[in-house]
């Protein structure tokens, strides 16, 4: 796949999942009324991030906003922090790598800053998506633990336990939020390593260290210099090479194994 | 002005069907819940069945279940409340409502009588 | 199911009196999604069709008389009449909209000594 292709494709797929993480993060179904016991229902209970609501039988559907912030789950907040991390890195990510598209011309941007920025945005990403993903697997972990506990309480005739305010005879188990949570993070993930894959071959030509040493006349040691490597941004590095071939090698083509030259 | 009109009752012999209609007018009946309710001579209200909006999801009282089936054709505004296996326990005036917010009955009609006996 | 018990079942009052009915449903009507209570109130006068007085235990549907008022939450509600008046003489029923089957109370019978 070519650079282009690949930067292309990790920014589309980081797009659909960032519009997904802000998706999931505005839906109201994070949990849904457990319907086993009673699938019947003419009330349906569902509660997301921001607000919990009612759909009746009657057509009508009414919600309520968590008016409060004292008063909420601690479980609660840092899984809304942890969304509303994600949908920032992901804008940040997104505005970054508009900038870093190798489709794109910018003034006299050259690939190097190119490349970059598309680590930058690749890793935004990563991490925005890593946000989502913990995000809903906190409130989903949430979700079992009250489901159990409220379950434990209706045979021993407790009431429900919940994070949320529940009625005695109400559950929650997972809504369609979680899903879309759940999918737009890993793609939100994936395009990030995308971008970041796509950031390797972004770099460019004279300094990806395909460094070549000459064989030098009276002595068979060539010294690369120090400050060439420096100049890339990557630190410097004067390490020796050994040549018993003769002629021009790259770095990229020295075996790691040994070699019928290494025992002479 | 809210409209629900029944219509169909009439004395039947246990065992016999019937089947109840229920003409609204004055509202846009596709976007309600309807159902029908039911008063044995001399007694209380009992709830009978139910139709959502959509006419994707029926409910039933336990002593109906498998012998009264409600419908809806929105396309005429007519309720329908069809009564198989009667049983002389299903005498009642049988009324027809709209639910609204709340899931109450905010408009009820005037009702029929159904009589099941021999 | 939901069991809706009312109390008393008949109750005779002077005119002007204020006068309370109860409801006790045997599971809580308060729903966890909008802290709404689903239970309503309805009026049937001899020879008519129940007329819808509250909804949410509290909400006064419209054209239904300030002197009346409903409250209550979970399993405890109450219908309030605080002036009785000639034309509210009828069967006053409390139902379950909670959970299907909708149920309603045995009524309560008004009646003016």
């Known amino acids: 796949m070519s650079v282009t292709a690949c930067q292309g494709l990790g920014f589309v797929v980081s797009l659909i999942g960032f519009a997904g993480i802000i998706a999931a993060t505005c839906m109201d179904q994070w949990s849904t009324q457990d319907l086993y016991n009673n699938p019947v229902t003419a009330v349906f209970n569902y509660q997301g991030l921001w607000r919990s609501c009612v759909r009746e039988s009657s057509g009508f559907t009414e919600c309520r906003g968590y008016f409060t912030l004292l008063g909420l789950p601690a479980m609660l907040q840092a899984v809304r922090a942890l969304m509303i991390v994600g949908i920032v890195l992901g804008v940040i990510g997104i505005l970054v790598s508009i900038f870093a598209l190798k489709c794109i011309r910018i003034g006299s941007m050259d690939d190097s800053a190119k490349a970059k920025m598309t680590l930058t945005s690749g890793i935004l990403f990563i991490i925005s998506g890593i946000c989502a993903i913990i995000g809903v697997s906190v409130f989903a972990n949430m979700l079992v633990t009250n489901f159990w506990m409220s379950t434990a309480n209706m045979y021993s005739g407790m009431g429900g336990m919940g994070g949320m305010v529940q009625t005695v005879q109400t559950r929650y188990t997972f809504g369609a939020a979680l899903f879309v949570g759940w999918v737009a993070g890993g793609l939100t993930l994936i395009g990030g390593v995308m971008m970041c894959i796509a950031c390797r071959g972004l770099t460019p030509d004279d300094s990806n260290f395909k460094a070549v040493s000459y064989h030098a006349s009276g002595q068979n040691v060539a010294y690369r210099p120090g400050g060439f490597k420096a100049s890339t941004g990557f630190g410097s590095n004067t390490r020796n090479k050994k040549i018993y071939d003769g002629g021009a090698r790259t770095e990229d083509d020295e075996q790691s194994h040994p070699t019928k030259y290494d025992y002479v | 002005e809210v409209q629900l009109l029944e219509s169909g009752g009439g004395l039947v012999q246990p065992g016999g069907s019937l089947r109840l209609s229920c003409a609204a007018s004055?509202?846009?009946?596709?976007?309600?819940?309807m159902s029908w309710v039911r008063q044995a001579p001399g007694k209380g209200l009992e709830w009978v069945a139910t139709?959502?909006?959509?006419?994707?999801?029926?409910y039933y009282a336990d002593s109906v279940k498998g012998r009264f089936t409600i419908s809806r054709d929105n396309s005429k505004n007519t309720l329908y409340l069809q009564m198989n296996s009667l049983r002389a326990e299903d005498t009642a005036v049988y009324y027809c409502?709209?639910?609204?917010?709340?899931?109450?009955?905010?408009?009820w009609g005037q009702g029929t009588l159904v009589t099941v006996s021999s | 199911d939901i069991v809706m018990t009312q109390s008393p079942d008949s109750l005779a009052v002077s005119l002007g009196e204020r006068v309370t009915m109860n409801c006790k449903s045997s599971?809580?009507?308060?729903?966890?999604?909008?802290?709404?209570?689903?239970l309503s109130w309805y009026q049937q006068k001899p020879g008519q069709p129940p007329k819808l007085l509250f909804y949410?235990?509290?909400t006064r549907e419209s054209g239904v008389p300030d002197r009346f008022s409903g409250s209550g939450s979970g399993t405890d509600f109450t219908l309030t009449i605080s002036s009785v008046q000639a034309e509210d003489v009828a069967v006053y029923y409390c139902?379950?909209?909670?959970?299907?089957?909708?149920?309603f109370g045995q009524g309560t019978k008004l009646e003016i000594k």
């Open positions: 409502t709209r639910l609204v917010k709340g899931n109450a009955m905010d408009y």
């Open positions: 004055g509202f846009t009946f596709s976007s309600y819940t």
């Open positions: 139709i959502i909006i959509g006419g994707s999801y029926t």
């Open positions: 599971q809580s009507l308060l729903s966890s999604g909008n802290q709404k209570n689903y």
């Open positions: 949410w235990a509290s």
């Open positions: 139902q379950n909209d909670y959970s299907y089957p909708f149920t």
